[in-house]
C-alpha cells in the first residue's frame, strides 16, 4: 500500500540528499527522511524513543494527509480512530468502537443501535407494513360454490424491514371463516381459486394468532336467510362430510 518508504542507510550529514533511499528528497543520519519527492507524503514513525521520517505514497492507517504547497504531510488521527478526515472527524473507528457523527464510542447512544458490519451507530428502524389488501374470495378446498363454510384471506406487504432493535413486524396474513355463496356447483366445476395460497389448517392446540376471532366478523357478513337452527347445522355437517370426500377426489 505505502510502497515508497525511504530511509537512509549510509552515514551522512543532515540535509544531504545524495544517498537517500526510496522517496526521500533530503534525509539525515538521525531523523531519516526530512523531505519527500513530489506527491509523496511525509510521516513520522516512532521507533523506540525516537521519531524517524518516512516517505509514503499515501498515509498509513490511523493518519490523514494534508497537501500543503511545500509538503504533503501525514497527521495522526485520534487514538481510537482508524481513518479520519481531520483531527475532529473520524470516518472509521478502530476495532471495538462504533462511529457516530465523527466520533468513536464504546456503545451507541440511546435511540441508536450498533451496525456490526459498518461498525457505525445507526437509527433504530421499526417495521412498517402496508394497508391490508382486500379479502380473497370465500373458498372451501379451493371452491367458491356449494353452500358451506369456507375461509377468506387477506395480506399486506412489509414496506420496511426492522433493524435488530426495531419493533418486529405484525402478521402479514389474516384468515377468517366465511360462508361460501349459496350456489350449486356445476358438474365438474373446479371453482374459482382464491388469490391466496391455501393456508395450512392449524392443528388442534396450534397457534391461531393470525386468525382473528371471526364470530363478530361473520355475524356482520351473514344475511337473514343464511341463519340456521342447530338441528339444520348438525344435518349439514353430516352432508358436508360426505361431500368433502367426493370433492377431495376431484383434481
Amino acid at each position: 500500500q505505502n510502497a515508497s518508504r525511504g530511509r537512509r542507510q549510509r552515514r551522512m550529514h543532515p540535509n544531504v540528499s545524495q544517498g537517500c533511499q526510496g522517496g526521500c528528497a533530503t534525509c539525515s543520519d538521525y531523523n531519516g527522511c526530512l523531505s519527500c519527492k513530489p506527491r509523496l507524503f511525509f510521516a513520522l514513525e516512532r521507533i523506540g524513543m525516537k521519531q524517524i521520517g518516512v516517505c509514503l505514497s499515501s498515509c498509513p492507517s490511523g493518519y490523514y494527509g494534508t497537501r500543503y504547497p511545500d509538503i504533503n504531510k501525514c497527521t495522526k488521527c485520534k487514538a481510537d480512530c482508524d481513518t479520519c478526515f481531520n483531527k475532529n472527524f473520524c470516518t472509521k473507528c478502530k476495532s471495538g468502537f462504533y462511529l457516530h457523527l465523527g466520533k468513536c464510542l464504546d456503545n451507541c447512544p440511546e435511540g441508536l443501535e450498533a451496525n456490526n458490519h459498518t461498525m457505525e451507530c445507526v437509527s433504530i428502524v421499526h417495521c412498517e407494513v402496508s394497508e391490508w389488501n382486500p379479502w380473497s374470495p370465500c373458498t372451501k378446498k379451493g371452491k367458491t360454490c356449494g353452500f358451506k363454510r369456507g375461509t377468506e384471506t387477506r395480506v399486506r406487504e412489509i414496506i420496511q424491514h426492522p433493524s435488530a432493535k426495531g419493533n418486529l413486524c405484525p402478521p402479514t396474513n389474516e384468515t377468517r371463516k366465511c360462508t361460501v355463496q349459496r350456489k350449486k356447483c356445476q358438474k365438474g366445476e373446479r371453482g374459482k381459486k382464491g388469490r391466496e395460497r391455501k393456508r395450512k389448517k392449524p392443528n388442534k392446540g396450534e397457534s391461531k394468532e393470525a386468525i382473528p376471532d371471526s364470530k363478530s366478523l361473520e355475524s356482520s357478513k351473514e344475511i337473514p336467510e343464511q341463519r340456521e337452527n342447530k338441528q339444520q347445522q348438525k344435518k349439514r355437517k353430516v352432508q358436508d362430510k360426505q361431500k368433502s370426500v367426493s370433492v377431495s377426489t376431484v383434481h
Epitope: Y64, T66, R67, Y68, D70, F85, N86, K87, F89
Partner: antibody, heavy 116, light 107 residues
Framework: EVQLVESGGGVVQPGRSLRLSCAAS????????MAWVRQAPGKGLEWVAT????????YYRDSVKGRFTLSRDNSKNTLYLQMNSLRAEDTAVYYC?????????WGQGTMVTVSS | DIQMTQSPSSLSASVGDRVTITCLAS??????LVWYQQKPGKAPKLLIY???RLQDGVPSRFSGSGSGTDFTLTISSLQPEDFATYFC?????????FGQGTKLEIK
Amino acid sequence: EVQLVESGGGVVQPGRSLRLSCAASGFTFSDYDMAWVRQAPGKGLEWVATIIYDGSRTYYRDSVKGRFTLSRDNSKNTLYLQMNSLRAEDTAVYYCAAHDRSFDYWGQGTMVTVSS
Amino acid sequence: DIQMTQSPSSLSASVGDRVTITCLASEDISNDLVWYQQKPGKAPKLLIYAASRLQDGVPSRFSGSGSGTDFTLTISSLQPEDFATYFCQQSYKYLPTFGQGTKLEIK
C-alpha cells in the same frame, strides 16, 4: 465551548496598516493550523492565509503576499494578522478559523473598511 | 488552484420542498469536500465533511453526495431555519477554495 474572538478591525485609509487579533479558547490551540478567511460585502468566502500549528510555516493567497503577515503566540492562545499597504479591495469581514483541511471553528468576524 | 463552481447561485423554494445544490471541482478532489451554511451577519457553520458525513448537531434532512468532481447538497424537506447561503469548499489541497455560494430564499 470553543470560542474564537476577533478584534482590531476598523476604518482605515488606503496604504495604511491594521493589526487583527484572534483570542482562542475551548480547544487545544497549539494543535491546530489557524487561518483567516474574509468576505467582502455581499460576496463569497475567500481564504487569506494559514499558519501551521507550531508557527513554523505560513501560506498566503497571492493578492496579500508581501503585504500581510500571519503570526501566532501559542502561550497566549492568540493569532495575529498584520495588514500593511491596505487597498480598497481588502475591505471585508475577516474571520479567524481553526483550519484542519476544513474550517472547523469560526470566530464572529471583524469588519475592515479601507476607504479614503 | 482548484476552481469550485456552485449552482445555482440563488434559489427560491418553499417550506417542505426538496432542494439540491451542486458543486463542481475543476479537477478530481476525491471526496475531500466540505459544505457550510451561513446566515446573514453570522459566521459560516460546517454542515458536511468528506462529501457525505454530517457534522454533529446537523439535522438528518441535510445530506451530501458525490466524489471526484461532482458533488451535491440535498435538503429533503426545507424548514424555515434552512433559508441561508450555502458554500462548498475543497479540502483536497492548498490553496483552500470555496464555491461562490448559493443563496436559498423563501418563494
